[in-house]
Amino acid sequence: HNTTVFQGVAGQSLQVSCPYDSMKHWGRRKAWCRQLGEKGPCQRVVSTHNLWLLSFLRRWNGSTAITDDTLGGTLTITLRNLQPHDAGLYQCQSLHGSEADTLRKVLVEVLADPLDHRDAGDLWFPGESESFEDAHVEHSISRSLLEGEIPFPPTS
C-alpha cells in the first residue's frame, strides 16, 4: 500500500477519505487505527456502527469521527481540533471476523495555522518571545507519499 498524506491545520478539522470497492467489502464494518511505530500494531481509534446497515451514522471517539458510505465505497474520518500530537501514520481498515484488511495507509501532517494563534506556544523556539502580527491559509487535502520520504515526522 502506498501512503497518502493528508495535511491539516492545527485547531481546525481534517477530513480523511478512504475509497474502496463497495462490492468486495460488502457487509464489512470499517475502522480507523493509529500505527504504533514502524512495525508495531495498529491501535484502533474508532470503528463504524456495530450494525453494518447503520454504517452511515457518524460515530465519535473523542475528537475523531467515522462514517461509511457503503454504496459509494468511501470511508470518511473527521479529526476535529487537530493538534500536533495527532500527526503520524494511520490506517483505514475493513473488518472481517478477527481479521482486518488495510484500505489505505494515511500519514497525517499537522501544520501551524497562521491565522489563528490561540495555541501559539509551539510556534517559536524556547527563549524566543515575539509578538504575532495579523494574519493567513487552508483545508484537508491529500497527496501520495513520494519515494524516499519518511513516513514518520521527526520529533522535536
Partner: antibody
Framework: EVKLEESGGGLVQPGGSMKLSCTAS????????MDWVRQSPEKGLEWVAE??????????YYAESVKGRFTISRDDSKSTVYLQMNSLRTEDTGIYYC?????????????WGQGTLVTVSA | QTQSPSSLAVSAGEKVTLSCKSS????????????LAWYQQKPGQSPKLLIS???TRESGVPDRFTGSGFGTDFTLTISSVQGEDLAVYYC????????FGAGTKLELK
C-alpha cells in the same frame, strides 16, 4: 485545469461600497479555503481575507486594515466567493486577486485569478 | 520580510541569488518545516508559485530555480537566467500573519 475569475471591480468614491465576485472551476470548490489578496504600488502584495470550508464552519479571517469594513462570503452551490467592501478608502485602491489553497498542499497560494482593479477616488 | 536587492540587472546565462530575511523565525518545530514561499510575477500577470516550504519546487517549475534557507534567512537562486525569468520575485511567510516581501525586480542588463 483550475480557473479563478474575478469580477466587480471599478471606480468608486471614498466611503462607497463595492462587491467583488470570484467564480472557480477545475476543482472541488466546497473543499477549498478561499482568499483575497490585493496589490498596489504603495503597499505591494497584501493579504486581505480568507474563508474556510464547511468542515471548518466557513470560518472567516481578515487583515487588521479591513476588519469591520470588508466581509468575505461564499456560495458553494455556485462555486463563488465574494468580497463585500464598505466604507472604502483611497488606500484600498489596487488589484484584487482571488486565490485558492486547494491543490493537495496547505498554506500557500497555489492558484490565482487574473485580478480585478478597484479604484477608490473622488 | 525584507528582500534584497530591490532590483537587479542581469545578463542571460548569469547565476542570480535573491535574498529574503524575516524578522521572526518561520520554522515550525512540530513538523520541521520553514513556512516560506517564493512567487514570480511577470508584467500584467498574477503571481505564480515557484517554491513552497522554503525549498520545495512546484510542479512544472524549471530546476534552475532553487530555494534554500532556514529560520529567518532565505535565498532563491536562479542558476542560469533565461529571458523568460525577467519578473518580480516575492517571498511570502505563512507561519504567523500572512505577509509578503516588497519584491526583487529582475531586469535585463
Amino acid at each position: 485545469e483550475v480557473k479563478l475569475e474575478e469580477s466587480g471591480g471599478g471606480l468608486v468614491q471614498p466611503g462607497g461600497s463595492m462587491k467583488l465576485s470570484c467564480t472557480a472551476s477545475g476543482f472541488t470548490f466546497s473543499d477549498a479555503w478561499m482568499d483575497w489578496v490585493r496589490q498596489s504600488p504603495e503597499k505591494g502584495l497584501e493579504w486581505v481575507a480568507e474563508i474556510r470550508n464547511k468542515v471548518n464552519n466557513h470560518a472567516t479571517y481578515y487583515a487588521e486594515s479591513v476588519k469591520g469594513r470588508f466581509t468575505i462570503s461564499r456560495d458553494d452551490s455556485k462555486s463563488t466567493v465574494y468580497l463585500q467592501m464598505n466604507s472604502l478608502r483611497t488606500e484600498d485602491t489596487g488589484i484584487y486577486y482571488c486565490t485558492s489553497l486547494y491543490d493537495g498542499y496547505y498554506l500557500r497560494f497555489a492558484y490565482w485569478g487574473q485580478g480585478t482593479l478597484v479604484t477608490v477616488s473622488a | 520580510q525584507t528582500q534584497s536587492p530591490s532590483s537587479l540587472a542581469v545578463s542571460a546565462g548569469e547565476k542570480v541569488t535573491l535574498s529574503c530575511k524575516s524578522s521572526q523565525s518561520v520554522f515550525y518545530s512540530s513538523n520541521q518545516k520553514n513556512y516560506l514561499a517564493w512567487y514570480q510575477q511577470k508584467p500584467g500577470q498574477s503571481p505564480k508559485l515557484l517554491i513552497s516550504w522554503a525549498s520545495t519546487r512546484e510542479s512544472g517549475v524549471p530546476d534552475r530555480f532553487t530555494g534554500s534557507g532556514f529560520g529567518t534567512d532565505f535565498t532563491l537562486t536562479i542558476s542560469s537566467v533565461q529571458g523568460e525569468d525577467l519578473a518580480v520575485y516575492y517571498c511570502h511567510q505563512y507561519l504567523s500573519s500572512l505577509t509578503f516581501g516588497a519584491g526583487t525586480k529582475l531586469e535585463l542588463k
